[in-house]
């Protein structure tokens, strides 16, 4: 959470961002909030980004203003419009890029002042895995897969019942480049696996960490996945 | 030259099936926002469905659950299956890139007429 | 959902004259999401302007686009005979995620 001040002159205002993630090939979302004002006219919101010459997006009088625009945004970002009033700022920036990743900030003027916030935005690839038992392996093994990552994640396993235990050993992880030559497919195999206990793959990286869990017993199979972003650093 | 073909129309009866398939050249499928766009005789132009740089998919809630858009990342293909097909549902059926800044490459249509 | 709303329906002009199509959008679009097309008889539709106001390429500069909020329009400065269309405006990122208005068939007089 970053939260920031206007500067000299008219009083300040309290502007602020959440650091957050983009999932590379969706829109994204760039938050940012303000002390409302009572008349949308007054309202003059701009998004830059450190080391781009022109603006990100410009909202003013009620509307967008896209003519200093950086042809790099052209085409791509919104802001949501009917919500500007209640002090909601956020940037939609769709289709989202590596090189959309940097410092962007949100700089504010209403009729009782200004004020900004930076933003740190990352950018990779995050996916939920999904753990099937497979049948063709010779003995019991666990097959997780996540169709795309990016930067290269880590694959860890865990096991309710051997809490703490060390799967490396047991396992075997690979990351395959996807057709667009950025993000990855990861599969990680986990052998020697025991019936009556539930198995964990859990896959980070600095953006986003994801756990598909399998519960194998006698009678039925039962799976579970959730992704969590690693996006709400206090600065 | 960046290139849309598709191919898989045709006359088909009424709660039948379909697969429609877009070829690209001269880009990669994955890296865009992939859509189907359809038009009826005589009408005007309807958005069907998307598929994310991601994978992701979304669809328009008048063929949500009858039809599934995907894509094969090696044959740099869009597709868009269609099942339980209706009267409705005849059109020609454009696939079309999003490259950010609007449907900027389409195919040439193909045409789909479902009548018994 | 965003409704479009285009007007005319149909707008009869001369070659060289000056043709303004209109689009209403049932809420606020933002102009970044904003695109106008042309299509011709048997053909697939192009894309004309996006962005509201920036011409897509090899688009003559007699096509221009304008408007913010909820109102958009295409301008054809002058009209040439190749430019007798339908033309339809479109807007991303609500649901459902494209949206298209009804058409404006722009034909000769």
């Known amino acids: 959470l970053i939260i920031g001040f206007g500067i000299s002159g008219r009083h300040s205002i309290t502007v602020t961002t959440v650091a957050s993630a983009g999932n590379i090939g969706e829109d994204g979302i760039l938050s940012c909030t303000f002390e409302p004002d009572i008349k949308l006219s007054d309202i003059v919101i701009q998004w830059l980004k450190e080391g781009v010459l022109g603006l990100v997006h410009e909202f003013k009088e009620g509307k967008d203003e896209l003519s200093e625009q950086d042809e790099m945004f052209r085409g791509r970002t919104a802001v949501f419009a009917d919500q500007v009033i209640v002090g909601n700022a956020s940037l939609r920036l769709k289709n989202v890029q590596l090189t959309d990743a940097g410092t962007y900030k949100c700089y504010i003027i209403t009729s009782k002042g200004k004020g900004n916030a930076n933003l740190e935005y990352k950018t990779g690839a995050f996916s939920m895995p999904e753990v099937n038992v497979d049948y063709n392996a010779s003995s019991e093994t666990l097959r997780c897969e996540a169709p795309r990552w990016f930067p290269q994640p880590t694959v860890v396993w865990a096991s309710q019942v051997d809490q703490g235990a060390n799967f490396s050993e047991v396992s075997n992880t690979s990351f395959e480049l996807n057709s667009e030559n950025v993000t990855m497919k990861v599969v990680s195999v986990l052998y020697n696996v025991t019936i009556n206990n539930t198995y964990s793959c859990m896959i980070e990286n600095d953006i986003a960490k994801a756990t598909g869990d399998i519960k194998v017993t006698e009678s039925e199979i039962k799976r579970r996945s959730h992704l969590q972003l690693l996006n709400s650093k206090a600065s | 030259e960046v290139q849309l073909v598709e191919s898989g129309g045709g006359l088909i009866q009424p709660g039948g099936s379909l697969r429609l398939s877009c070829a690209a050249s001269g880009f990669i499928v994955s890296r865009n926002y992939m859509n189907w766009v359809r038009q009826a005789p005589g009408k005007g132009l309807e958005w069907v469905s998307v598929i994310y740089g991601s994978g992701r998919t979304d669809s328009a809630d008048s063929v949500k659950g009858r039809f599934t858009i995907s894509r094969d990342n090696s044959k740099n293909t869009l597709y868009l299956q269609m099942n339980s097909l209706r009267a409705e549902d005849t059109a020609v059926y454009y696939c079309?890139?999003?490259?950010?800044?609007?449907?900027?490459?389409w195919g040439q249509g193909t045409t789909v007429t479902v009548s018994s | 959902e965003i409704v479009l709303t285009q007007s005319p329906g149909t707008l009869s002009l001369s070659p060289g004259e000056r043709a303004t199509l209109s689009c209403r959008a049932s809420q606020s679009v933002s102009s970044s999401y904003l695109a106008w097309y042309q299509q011709k008889p048997g053909q697939a539709p192009r894309l004309l302007i996006y962005?509201?106001?920036s011409r897509a390429t090899g688009i003559p500069d007699r096509f221009s686009g304008s408007g913010s909020g909820t109102d958009f329009t295409l301008t054809i400065s002058r009209l040439e005979p190749e430019d007798f269309a339908v033309y339809y405006c479109q807007q991303y990122g609500s649901s459902p995620l494209y949206t298209f208005g009804q058409g404006t068939k722009l034909e000769i007089k």
């Open positions: 962005g509201a106001s």
């Open positions: 079309a890139r999003d490259a950010d800044y609007g449907l900027d490459v």
